[in-house]
């Protein structure tokens, strides 16, 4: 495939990523899946500047990231090493917490209303934003 | 694996500059925070800066501000520090590390100020 | 600036639990990660977010959080682990690293 060089109609670019910010919820399978489905992933924070640049653009809602913890340690879901990583917990967070009675603990994480991260039950009906690298191969074929 | 490696002991006079230098690898050089820090003979560590290399932003502490300059050229994976108008408490040994939490530390470089 | 307050000197017996404390109020917002130093040696990370250890680091090894303290707790303390303790966290901006003063750990 060839190099994306601009980001899609409804992307927003930064830092040679774009970025697609939902305005319905979905729990975090279904919004792993519609990001994979636009040859994207649920974003990955690697720095303070990314941080701020996603929560300036999603404000004070609870909105899924690309971190979960569903087959034990916590996981990017690019493969971006997690113990070496930036990260942005809440106090006292994560706690995969059981007194939700929903079953089971909390495996998925989000950004909260002031920014900072948490892990939450991941069936949860959260808005989410979807990341793509600009430098990356584009799926679809060049255009001749 | 990771590993940092620093370059050599130095001596200068007070009022020099002194650039430090940390060569990473076995790891994507962009993907990790790295950062500066020094410890005085007997003392404890004390952060000198930050420097996210894949943009190249940096946070010095307000200590150093003006006179510590964090740049790194991804092209050879290596950080540089470089400390101005130096004066005898600047003796230490400087170390770089690199992670968020500073996951992995080089071998530290010995800075002597001496007239 | 943020600070954090550790004891400069705690002992324990062969064998026995000991906990190093590090206090400060940057740490009601951002974890403390905690640094083993052996002297003539660099500093190894034993403890980041919460409670979690890098491969390699003992499972004596914990950490907890409680207000404006941080704990590193060592379950069966061993002659290796004679060394300084460092804690750090982040200041309130989040992006400027604070070190506590260090506690140097004997083993008797």
């Known amino acids: 495939g060839s190099e994306r060089t601009c980001c899609p109609v409804n992307w927003v670019e930064h830092e040679r990523s774009c970025y697609w910010f939902s305005r319905s919820g979905k729990a975090w399978a279904d919004a792993d899946n519609y990001c994979r489905l636009e040859d994207a992933h649920l974003v990955v924070v690697t720095s303070w500047e990314e941080q701020k640049f996603v929560q300036h653009h999603i404000g004070p809602v609870n909105t899924w990231m690309g971190l979960h913890d569903q087959n034990g340690p916590w996981k990017w879901v690019d493969g971006t090493d997690y113990e070496t990583g930036f990260k942005n917990w809440r106090p006292e967070q994560p706690d995969d917490w059981y007194g939700h009675g929903l079953g089971g603990g909390e495996d998925c994480a989000h950004f909260t209303d002031d920014g900072r991260w948490n892990d939450d039950v991941c069936q949860r009906p959260y808005r989410w934003v979807c990341e793509t690298e600009l430098d990356k191969a584009s799926q679809e074929p060049p255009l001749l | 694996q990771v590993q940092l490696v620093q370059s050599g002991a130095e001596v200068k006079k007070p009022g020099a500059s002194v650039t430090v230098s940390c060569k990473a690898s076995?790891?994507?050089?962009?993907?990790?925070?790295m950062y500066w820090v020094r410890q005085a003979p007997g003392q404890g560590l004390e952060w000198v800066g930050t420097i996210n290399p894949s943009g190249g932003s940096t946070d010095y502490a307000q200590k150093f501000q003006g006179r510590v300059t964090m740049t790194r050229d991804t092209s050879t994976s290596t950080l540089y520090m470089e400390l101005n108008s130096l004066r005898s408490e600047d003796t230490a040994v400087y170390y770089c590390?690199?992670?968020?939490?500073?996951?992995?530390w080089g071998q530290g470089t010995l800075v002597t100020v001496s007239s | 600036s943020s600070e954090l307050t550790q004891d400069p000197a705690v002992s324990v017996a062969l064998g026995q639990t000991v906990r190093i404390t590090c206090q400060g109020d940057s740490l009601r917002n951002y974890y403390a990660s905690w640094y083993q130093q052996k002297p003539g040696q660099a500093p190894i990370l034993v403890i980041y977010?919460?409670?979690s250890r890098p491969s390699g680091i003992p499972d004596r090894f914990s950490g907890s959080t409680s207000g404006n303290t941080a704990s590193l707790t060592i379950t069966g303390a061993q002659a290796e682990d004679e060394a300084d303790y460092y804690c750090?966290?982040?200041?309130?901006?989040?992006?400027?690293?604070?070190f506590g003063g260090g506690t140097k750990l004997t083993v008797l």
């Open positions: 750090n966290s982040r200041d309130s901006s989040g992006n400027h690293v604070v």
């Open positions: 977010t919460k409670n």
């Open positions: 590390a690199s992670g968020w939490e500073l996951n992995y």
């Open positions: 076995g790891y994507t050089f962009r993907s990790y925070y």
